[in-house]
């Protein structure tokens, strides 16, 4: 019930967050115009990783594509190279983990293979919003920079006669929307790993085997062959279960699909 | 077609309060800032204020002191222009005017003469 | 703030001439944004609302006939007119729509000579 929470969880926060990487991709607002200086502006300007725009006071907003791809900056290239990739990594993590949810019964589908497709899933949405965390992080860097480039320049002119304002971007909200999805599809990957430590077949469970020597009656019965840890007695509360009424001779052990939690 | 007509009073007393209203048809109102200039007798234009289309933002010249408020009725597509403790130097045309395009003032009412005399 | 200067403040022409009003700013008018420059051109007669002639420095208004234009950039600006008319004898003003508080310029009346 616990595994299905998480990954069910985990599914629903990923979601969340790659719609936000989307949003954040798609949105205009990645800098806005600083309004520092002059709070009043009838003119805002605002930029995307795909397009410009002009607010004006009176209503009136127009916006630009970039209609050149060698023109642009290369960080500019590289942000939207990095949203993208975040976005096909969290597309095909979600369309694997629909797959892989407990709560949905695909055919026969092993227990194992939901697992798998349940980590791989979970390392797709981490890889993600890692992506989008890094492509936010760059261009706000790149902000970070020009900035105090264009306060170092803040007036040119001629003596001081005529003064020509520079421009100044500071953080959109495209970029606090980029933050919160990166980090919100992470910790969504992050559970879906978890969970998927819960759906995995930690041990094969062999049964007590009484071997019985000519002339003694003790009954020798080995641990457990657990996985991960090598040989051991089955020291966690794991149900064995019995093939049934049958002489101990006759006890084989059966590998069940109901001995993992 | 797009039309703006000015109404008030004509004469105001000094430190009286004067209300100036701006009726306009012929287009969509709430989609457009719209501004007061004057003009006082044989002078340049004069910027009074600005209020943006859904009446969210309002800029006023600084020069003008405090005295301006500037509100819009989008039911009614009417802008309205209050001046408090009117003074003589007051005395001006009140034109209203729609913003457009590099908040460029398309279209004006005809203006009104304002006078502010004891 | 920024202030806007019109030169010449009164000028004598007659109808066929060539006509520059020139405009000068405190402040660059051009927003990178966009590279549009905010500055409008109007025109007043007497006893009447002024009536939009030029936007973002150079673009006409729809209606306003081909003889008038504007260009420059940044602090410097002209309107032209290149034949004048007798319908164009009127005060013409420059304005700042780049930023608050806007400005106008003081003016330049045409007359016949």
């Known amino acids: 019930m616990a595994v299905t929470a998480c990954q069910g969880l985990g599914f629903v926060v990923s979601l969340i967050g790659i719609a936000g990487i989307i949003a954040a991709t798609c949105m205009d607002q990645w800098s806005t115009q600083d309004l520092y200086n002059n709070p009043v502006t009838a003119v805002f300007n605002y930029q995307g990783l795909w397009r410009s725009c002009v607010r004006e006071s009176s209503g009136f907003t127009e916006c630009r594509g970039y209609f050149t791809l060698l023109g642009l900056p290369a960080m500019l290239q590289a942000v939207r190279a990095l949203m993208i990739v975040g976005i096909v990594l969290g597309a095909i993590g979600l369309l694997v983990s629909i797959f892989a949810l407990k709560c949905i019964r695909i055919g026969s589908m092993e227990d194992s293979a939901k697992a798998n497709m349940t980590l791989t899933s979970g390392i797709m949405f981490i890889v993600s919003g890692l992506c989008a965390i890094a492509g936010v992080s760059v261009f706000a860097n790149m902000l970070v920079t020009n900035f105090w480039m264009s306060t170092a320049n803040m007036y040119t002119g001629m003596g001081g006669m005529v003064q020509t304002v520079q421009t100044r971007y500071t953080f959109g909200a495209a970029l606090f929307v980029g933050w919160v999805a990166g980090g919100l599809t992470l910790i969504g990957g992050v559970m879906m790993c978890i969970a998927c430590r819960g759906l995995a077949p930690e041990e094969t469970n062999y049964k007590a085997v009484s071997y019985h020597a000519s002339g003694h009656s003790v009954a020798y019965k080995p641990g457990g062959f657990k996985a991960s840890t090598g040989f051991g007695s089955n020291t966690k509360n794991k149900k064995i279960y019995d093939g049934g009424a049958r002489t101990e001779d006759e006890v084989q052990s059966y590998p069940s699909k109901h001995d993992y939690v | 077609q797009v039309t703006l007509r000015e109404s008030g009073p004509a004469l105001v007393k000094p430190t009286q309060t004067l209300t100036l209203t701006c009726t306009a048809s012929g287009f969509t109102f709430s989609s457009y800032g719209m501004s007061w200039v004057r003009q006082p007798p044989g002078k340049a234009l004069e910027w009074v204020a600005t209020i943006s289309g859904g009446g969210s933002y309002t800029y006023y010249n600084p020069s003008l002191k405090d005295r301006f408020t500037i509100s819009r009725d989008i039911s009614a597509n009417q802008l309205v222009l209050k001046v408090t403790n009117m003074d003589p130097a007051d005395t001006a045309t009140y034109f209203c005017?729609?913003?457009?395009?590099?908040?460029?003032?398309?279209?004006w009412g005809q203006g009104t003469t304002v006078t502010v005399s004891s | 703030d920024i202030q806007m200067t019109q030169s010449p403040s009164t000028l004598s022409a007659s109808v066929g001439d060539r006509v520059t009003i020139t405009c000068k700013s405190s402040?660059?008018?051009?927003?990178?944004?966009?590279?549009?420059?905010?500055l409008t051109w109007y025109q007043q007669k007497p006893g009447k609302a002024p009536k939009l002639l030029i936007y973002?420095?150079?673009t006409r208004e729809s209606g306003v006939p081909s003889r008038f234009s504007g260009s420059g950039s940044g602090t410097e600006f002209t309107l032209t007119i290149s034949s004048l008319q007798p319908d164009d004898f009127a005060t013409y003003y420059c304005q700042n729509d780049y930023s608050y508080p806007l400005t106008f310029g003081g003016g330049t009346k045409v007359e016949i000579k």
């Open positions: 973002w420095a150079s």
């Open positions: 402040q660059s008018l051009l927003n990178s944004g966009n590279q549009k420059n905010y």
């Open positions: 005017a729609r913003q457009s395009r590099g908040n460029a003032m398309d279209y």
